[in-house]
């Protein structure tokens, strides 16, 4: 089962054909190297998405480098290919599941003075899904608030405040939101999570509060890059990946992700029986895209030599602003109760089979459901423990 | 069945020091971690520290820091408490408790040490 | 370091009467944990990870609370249920216990 969740897997630009870049990665390593012990959470589908979305407006060497800095090569006649991959995909994701709960989506928001084209408008409602609204910016503040509400609504309430502050000369705002709360296939045991010393480094402990569970699991030691990585599905088709560098070897983990050491990993995993613990947490990412993206050469589109001719035929827009963030939640819930027997707590030397893992410092995760739906580090587990019921 | 059995009662000198054993049986400390936890006559609980011995370090509460160290001896299965420049407020009930990644924290005590600090 | 204030120090109850001990901690907790100690004997793990009951810890006993406002809650008292309950954090370090509630049968 997690062969043909290998098999299925886009790991590029999502439905990427021929990739001179390696999209995802290098996004995830210009975060890591922006801020070395933030936590870091991106969706690349979701960024590549909402890239591939505005594309559809941009011309000429704005279009280029869109959809060359996402890695993708495409001759004219692929480009409706694309988009309607995108279409596809996000059908398919933001299906109703029994216990999976995934929002997506994009808007654009744009100053009332800018007319946008029907074309663009029928085409980002029809392959994307996407609303546009007039806004107006000279209004900061109440502007601030019509973006905020409308992400909050469309992610029932799990994404509030997207925006922090708002430049009354903004032209053009593209929000691209991704919330995602899914059940494991087998849950963890309530009563197996305690608090638990996590090192943030080897100076720094914090008390998180640490699911555990002993089962068989996806596993595999990469001696190369040395790590740990162990898969635990989800109900449904997701899988998170856990990767534990060894201790001061995250760095050397980081520079070697790449579609190829993902594709790796899925395909040399084993059943093996583990204790896995892990911190139960909520994890967040915001990033201004359009402070980000220029490394990764796309940057025409946020500056006066913006052509997005296709958008409007104002003849000097430009996106002032990118907003991507996504939201994810780690607890015990799984739709199959975890095994009732008292293997949480027995003695080790009645399991000499079975391995621990404990991710008590600073680890990876990637959400994988065909296409890497998240990407993340976690340096220090978030502490929003509440023990909601609506699980 | 796990066991913590801890050592006798130890009357000692105001400023001189002690060291009291938790020797575990049942388990292998190796996987733990060990508290140790002061109790003065007709008073409440104190945490002093714990060895964890998985990621090999130890952590004190301030107020014991500088006169209390923990450590442990994985080939004779125990675990110390050293306490030094002892004072008549230092007479108590010592008690260890067993920790660790696959048992409940603090779900296994021993039995207690009297330490009388006394001229 | 996190404070926890036991409330009420000491108190009676008559046999079936329902007793609330609280506990609160002056940061917010990941979790509430609650020994039970007679005279002469080593405390006892009673409710754990705010609200599970330990290994032969009688259903008449339940924990509940979350932030910084934690209970442990007897529906019938029972004369064995005399003891001293301490409440304890093991949020933060340093670990830190409540005073102690004495739990006299009437």
């Known amino acids: 089962e997690m062969k043909k969740r290998v098999e299925d897997l886009h790991v590029g630009a999502t439905v990427a054909p021929s990739s001179r870049r390696d999209f995802t990665f290098d996004l995830y390593r210009v975060l890591a190297s922006a801020a070395p012990s933030q936590n870091i959470f991106f969706s690349p589908v979701s960024i590549s998405m909402s890239l591939a979305m505005l594309s559809l407006g941009a011309g000429s060497s704005t279009k280029m480098q869109i959809l060359e800095g996402l890695g993708l090569n495409l001759q004219k006649s692929s480009e409706e290919e694309l988009h309607r991959g995108f279409q596809q995909l996000l059908q398919e994701l933001n299906q109703p599941r029994d216990g999976f709960q995934l929002s997506l989506g994009n808007a654009l928001f744009t100053d009332l003075v800018v007319d946008l084209q029907d074309t663009f408008v029928s085409a980002m409602k029809t392959l994307y899904l996407a609303d546009t609204f007039p806004t107006n910016f000279r209004d900061s503040a109440g502007a601030m608030k019509q973006i905020n509400d409308y992400v909050a609504k469309q992610t029932k309430g799990k994404i509030v405040d997207l925006l922090k502050n708002l430049d009354s000369n903004a032209v053009v705002i593209m929000v691209n939101y991704i919330f995602f709360k899914a059940k494991w296939e087998t849950s963890f045991n309530h009563k197996g999570t305690q608090e638990q010393d996590f090192y943030v480094t080897s100076e720094t402990v914090v008390r998180v509060p640490m699911m555990s569970r002993e089962d068989q699991y996806h596993y595999l030691l990469d001696r190369n890059l040395s790590c740990r990585v162990v898969g635990v599905p989800y109900q449904g088709n997701a899988t998170a990946l856990f990767i534990l560098p060894s201790e001061g070897k995250m760095q050397q983990v980081e520079n070697g992700l790449s579609e190829k050491t993902l594709r790796k990993w899925l395909k040399m995993f084993k059943k093996r029986q583990l204790e896995l613990y892990l911190p139960k947490f909520s994890i967040e990412g915001s990033y201004q895209l359009e402070k980000v993206l220029p490394s990764l050469g796309i940057s025409n589109v946020f500056t006066s030599h913006a052509d997005l001719s296709g958008i409007s035929n104002h003849s000097n827009i430009q996106v002032s602003e990118m907003v991507h963030k996504a939201v994810v939640e780690v607890d015990e819930s799984g739709t199959r109760a975890a095994a009732a027997t008292g293997t949480i707590f027995t003695f080790r030397s009645a399991r000499l089979n079975s391995q621990r893992l404990v991710f008590n410092r600073p680890f990876l995760m990637f959400i994988v459901d065909n296409n890497i739906l998240f990407l993340g580090k976690v340096n220090r587990p978030g502490s929003d423990y509440k023990d909601d019921d609506d699980k | 069945e796990v066991q913590l059995q801890q050592s006798g009662a130890e009357l000692v000198k105001p400023g001189a020091s002690v060291k009291l054993s938790c020797t575990a049986s049942g388990f292998d400390i190796r996987d733990t971690f060990m508290h140790w936890v002061k109790q003065r006559p007709e008073q409440g609980l104190e945490w002093i520290g714990r060895i964890d011995l998985v990621n090999v370090n130890t952590k004190y509460d301030p107020n014991f820091q500088d006169r209390a160290t923990i450590t442990a001896d994985t080939s004779s299965n125990t675990a110390y408490l050293q306490l030094t420049s002892l004072t008549s407020e230092d007479t108590a009930v010592y008690y260890c408790?067993?920790?660790?990644?696959?048992?409940?924290?603090?779900?296994?005590w021993g039995q207690g040490t009297l330490v009388t600090v006394s001229a | 370091q996190i404070v926890l204030t036991q409330s009420p120090a000491i108190m009676s109850a008559s046999p079936g009467e329902k007793v609330t001990i609280t506990c609160s901690a002056t940061?917010?907790?990941?979790?509430m944990h609650w020994f039970q100690q007679k005279p002469g004997t080593s405390p006892k793990l009673w409710i754990y990870?705010?609200?599970n009951l330990a290994s032969g810890v009688p259903a008449r006993f339940s924990g509940s609370g979350s932030g910084t406002s934690y209970s442990l809650t007897i529906s019938r008292m029972e004369a064995e249920d005399a003891a001293t309950y301490y409440c304890q954090q093991r949020s933060s370090y340093p670990f830190t216990f409540g005073s102690g509630t004495k739990l006299e049968i009437k």
């Open positions: 408790a067993r920790g660790g990644y696959d048992v409940r924290e603090f779900a296994y």
């Open positions: 990870s705010t609200s």
């Open positions: 940061s917010s907790l990941i979790y």
